[in-house]
């Protein structure tokens, strides 16, 4: 008949498994339980995937691996008496008197429960990596952490290459023995030890679980070190950069940590496994029973088959590893799980021109000299689209793309952002808001919903803020409805008249040029260059100023650049910014200074795009280490990442305006990176590409 083969990872566990099998058999529990010996949890997962075993209980990290790599699913969860249902929370604790936040952890002293422990290491390190605060090059997480904190106590890190930094705060026992041991010999080991490390002032932050502070303060702890501690003297660090009272752990934590769970193959009936174990726990989980499912004492070990603290097993409703782990823990695991053995030795960068090939070659050499990993290789392609095709086909790994290309790369080729460019705050030409500017006019005021029949001024056909975003947004919102994919005609029929300068027109609707004025002699009307006085963002604003148009679609800085004395040309010299307003998507009007809240979209910075199976943290980790050496345009290290002047080109590999490469943080998809409004505008336009 039917049988369930449990996978044991050690001799003691095999022993307990045999006893459980025997107890179940004697009690007549069906199906019968057999035991298979594996060498480790990883090995057991492989055995289950290969149909040589059926079930094992795993912790969160292993559930993630088993689900992601082998398609296993969790079907039965553990519940612990003292915990919060089937989970507990990983928190970061600081002294109330300090000024540390989650955003200022770099350089502070840190206390951890132990190397590779869930709340003391896996969750905080994974979270810091995943959120982009901690960059890891070449999967060397230990090095990254040792460089990031200003000294730590990570019990168990003594055997690593970075023990000087990772064990710097550890103290051992009262006689100085067992420094940095992953055992009670180290006074700063485990939850209470990590908290003690913080409380005694050795560290500035402790990574512990939600109950640790309350269990070790306000007179609840016996050891002398904790007697006088008050819970009110400590606070939690929240993910949003704020801090909260230690009782607020449900709202303020790094991640909810899932309980251990029994995993099986996707084709195994989870209900059957639960019924088997439920029968077992009904008979074998209380004090006097002949076999103790949730105790390992008899075998001289802890947590065999199940955690000893398990109070009951419950069925899992949504049997996917993602649902069980929850998005917070899932994200932390993504940041942490980086196997150096599976890291490709090269990152193949897509290049589009001879100057770019030259710069890329120099970058590869410069990175190699500094032993940066993975090494750069340069691969040519004919166009951004060709790059996307080659990345999808696994012939290339990465390319930097602009907003519209990011949209195509994500939507059509399934690529994701791995790192982004960041420009100077005052640099409005590379990342900016698209706004609709109107004259302040109380008697004839209209809103964005009332643009039909108005006169419009645009920087030029195909310009992001002048055409693509506003027209895309109006299509997406249903105001402009192109027939037969003819956007130009639809726009020409929507507005009463427009100025949309264009190069090499064909069949261009005349009304899109009706407001254009050409040069001083009246020639070159509507041409896509500065001979047309209403061309470009400045020209579009001038079209509004001179009353040719009722609305101008421009950048958020255009009004400021051409008013209040910032432009001395006769048409602009006397203009005041307060005479103009913005039209907002919600139907309101706003001051021109309110562009961040009242805009059609933000034009996103360029981003490095990769396949979804590429480890984005290693890509950012490489770029982050590289920019420390080569990011400054005045560096003396022989290569300038963000400067193309040596190659007789511009914006090669990265935009020259880039100040630094930044992590994508939570913007892990093309839609997240581009922003909803920009995507909506592009979708409006792309819906017309027939």
């Amino acid at each position: 008949g039917m049988e369930v083969r449990w996978c044991a990872t050690s001799d003691p566990e095999q022993h307990k498994c045999g006893n459980m099998s025997e107890a179940f058999r004697e009690a007549g529990i069906q199906p019968s339980l057999l035991c298979v010996r594996g060498t480790s949890a990883d090995h057991c997962v492989q055995l289950i995937a290969a149909q040589e075993a059926d079930a094992i209980t795993l912790d969160g990290g292993a559930i993630y691996e088993a689900g992601k790599e082998h398609g296993l699913k969790p079907v039965v969860g553990e519940v612990y008496d003292q915990e919060v249902g089937t989970s507990y929370y990983a928190v970061a604790v600081v002294r109330r008197s300090s000024h540390v936040t989650i955003d200022t952890l770099k350089g502070v002293k840190s206390c951890h429960t132990g190397i590779n422990r869930t709340v003391g290491w896996n969750v905080p390190v994974g979270y810091l990596v995943e959120s982009g605060r901690l960059s890891v090059m070449g999967c060397d997480v230990l090095k990254a952490v040792s460089d990031y904190f200003g000294g730590s106590c990570v019990p168990g890190a003594g055997e690593t290459s970075y023990s000087e930094s990772l064990c710097r705060l550890c103290r051992g026992d009262s006689s100085g023995e067992g420094v940095c041991d992953k055992s009670p010999l180290e006074r700063y080991y485990d939850y209470s030890g990590a908290f003690r490390c913080l409380a005694e002032g050795a560290g500035d932050v402790a990574f512990v679980k939600h109950s640790t502070v309350l269990e070790n303060t306000d007179g609840k702890t016996l050891p002398s070190w904790g007697q006088a501690l008050l819970s009110q003297d400590f606070e939690l660090l929240c993910r949003d950069g704020s801090r909260a009272d230690v009782t607020e752990w449900r709202q303020c934590h790094l991640a909810r940590v899932p309980a251990h769970a029994v995993v099986v193959r996707a084709d195994t009936d989870g209900g059957l496994i639960f019924r088997l174990l439920n029968e077992g726990q009904r008979l074998f989980s209380h004090e006097g029973s002949s076999f103790q499912m949730f105790s390992s004492e008899a075998y001289g070990q802890k947590d065999l088959l199940f955690k000893d603290s398990t109070s009951e097993l419950v069925p899992i409703a949504t049997q996917t590893y993602e649902a069980w782990l929850g998005h917070e823990y899932l994200h932390a695991m993504k940041g942490l799980l980086c196997d150096p053995n599976r890291l490709p030795p090269y990152l193949r960068w897509c290049v589009l021109s001879t100057p770019e090939i030259q710069k890329c070659g120099d970058m590869a050499v410069a990175f190699r000299r500094q032993r940066l990993k993975p090494e750069i290789q340069c691969v040519s392609a004919k166009s951004p689209q060709h790059c996307m095709e080659r990345i999808q086909a696994e012939q290339v790994d990465a390319v930097t793309l602009s907003g519209e290309d990011i949209y195509t790369a994500g939507k059509t080729y399934g690529l994701v952002p791995a790192a982004g460019e960041h420009y100077a705050p005052e640099d409005s030409s590379n990342s900016y808001y698209v706004v609709a500017v109107v004259r302040r006019d109380s008697s004839h005021a209209f809103t964005l919903d009332e643009l039909r029949g108005k006169r419009s001024c645009h920087a030029g056909f195909g310009s992001p803020a002048g055409w693509d975003v506003p027209v895309g947004a109006l299509i997406q919102r249903g105001f402009i409805r192109p027939k037969d994919c003819d956007v130009l005609t639809a726009v020409s029929e929507f507005f009463n008249a427009s100025c949309v300068p264009v190069n090499n027109p064909k069949n261009y609707p005349s009304s899109l040029c009706a407001l254009c004025v050409g040069d001083e002699q009246g020639r070159n009307k509507c041409v896509g260059n500065s001979q047309e006085r209403y061309y470009g963002y400045r020209g579009a604003f001038r079209c509004l100023v001179e009353n040719a148009g009722d609305v101008a679609f421009v950048r958020h800085t255009t009004v400021f650049d051409n008013t209040n004395g910032h432009n001395s040309e006769p048409w602009a010299a006397e203009l005041r910014s307060e005479d103009y307003e913005l039209l907002c998507p919600n139907g309101a009007r706003a001051e021109v200074s309110q562009f961040a809240a009242c805009n059609l979209a933000q034009i996103p910075p360029h981003a490095v795009m990769v396949r979804p199976d590429t480890n984005i943290f290693t890509v950012y980790g490489l770029l982050d280490k590289a920019q420390d050496l080569f990011g400054d345009d005045h560096n003396k290290n022989g290569f300038k990442m963000f400067d193309s002047s040596n190659y007789h080109g511009q914006d090669l590999l990265f935009k020259d305006a880039t100040v630094r490469a930044v992590p994508v943080g939570e913007k892990t998809t093309y839609r997240g990176w581009l922003g909803l409004d920009y995507v909506a505008a592009l979708e409006g336009m792309s819906s017309q590409q027939c």
């Epitope: 037969d484 994919c485 003819d486 008249a497 027109p505 069949n507 261009y508 005349s510 009307k525």
Partner: antibody
Framework: EVQLVQSGAEVKKPGESLKISCKGS????????LHWVRQMPGKGLEWMGR????????SYNQIFKDQVTISADKSISTAYLQWSSLKASDTAMYYC???????????WGQGTTVTVSS | DIQMTQSPSSLSASVGDRVTITCKAS??????VAWYQQKPGKAPKLLIY???TRHAGVPSRFSGSGSGTDFTLTISSLQPEDFATYYC?????????FGQGTKVEIK
């Protein structure tokens, strides 16, 4: 050089159907609109409608909307104007004209005379 | 639809004369007006668009002006080959509409 060559003169009876043609050469046929314009004997010019040969999208003057059909076959660079049932009042010269930079007639064919008489 | 009214409907002039034809639109068409020349038995030829922009190959004696609703075609010095019928057309909104034509005859 841009050339639009129209089919020859037609003499038809009322109620008959007719299809006249206009073949474009010297340019990429699908790049520009093709318009049809009517000129009745001794009268002025009337725009009938246009077609985008690239996707066969049409736009008609309401006066002519249910009277004629404009079509195109891009494989042979030819546009057509057809009637399913001619009337005496359809007697006229019909011109095809190609668009240019802008979306109105720039270059004209030599015209096709259509005579409808019982 | 936008109506285009041309005047005069015909005029007689001699070679070398300066000739002016006017066209009035029933509503504001900005500068979106074209002028065509048609000789007997021939197809029309585009002379001017955007009220004042000469089409390629059109002699400089032809010029146009105007915006809004009032437009003018001027032939600065009439040549023998200029005797023809001239039509204005608005290219602001479909349906494109033409004036009824002005016939320039030899005096």
């Amino acid at each position: 050089e841009v050339q639009l060559v129209q089919s020859g003169a037609e003499v038809k009876k009322p109620g008959e159907s007719l299809k006249i043609s206009c073949k474009g050469s010297g340019y990429s046929f699908t790049d520009y609109y093709l318009h049809w314009v009517r000129q009745m004997p001794g009268k002025g010019l009337e725009w009938m409608g246009r077609i985008n040969p690239y996707n066969a999208a049409t736009s008609y003057n309401q006066i002519f909307k249910d009277q004629v059909t404009i079509s195109a076959d891009k494989s042979i660079s030819t546009a057509y104007l057809q009637w399913s049932s001619l009337k005496a009042s359809d007697t006229a010269m019909y011109y095809c004209a190609r668009g240019g930079d802008y979306d109105f007639p720039w270059y004209w064919g030599q015209g096709t005379t259509v005579t409808v008489s019982s | 639809d936008i109506q285009m009214t041309q005047s005069p409907s015909s005029l007689s002039a001699s070679v070398g004369d300066r000739v002016t034809i006017t066209c009035k639109a029933s509503q504001d068409v900005y500068a979106a007006v074209a002028w065509y020349q048609q000789k007997p038995g021939k197809a029309p030829k585009l002379l001017i668009y955007w009220a004042s922009t000469r089409h390629a190959g059109v002699p400089s004696r032809f010029s146009g002006s105007g915006s809004g609703t009032d437009f003018t075609l001027t032939i600065s010095s009439l040549q023998p080959e200029d005797f023809a019928t001239y039509y204005c057309q608005q290219h602001y909104r479909t349906p494109w509409t033409f004036g009824q034509g002005t016939k320039v005859e030899i005096k």
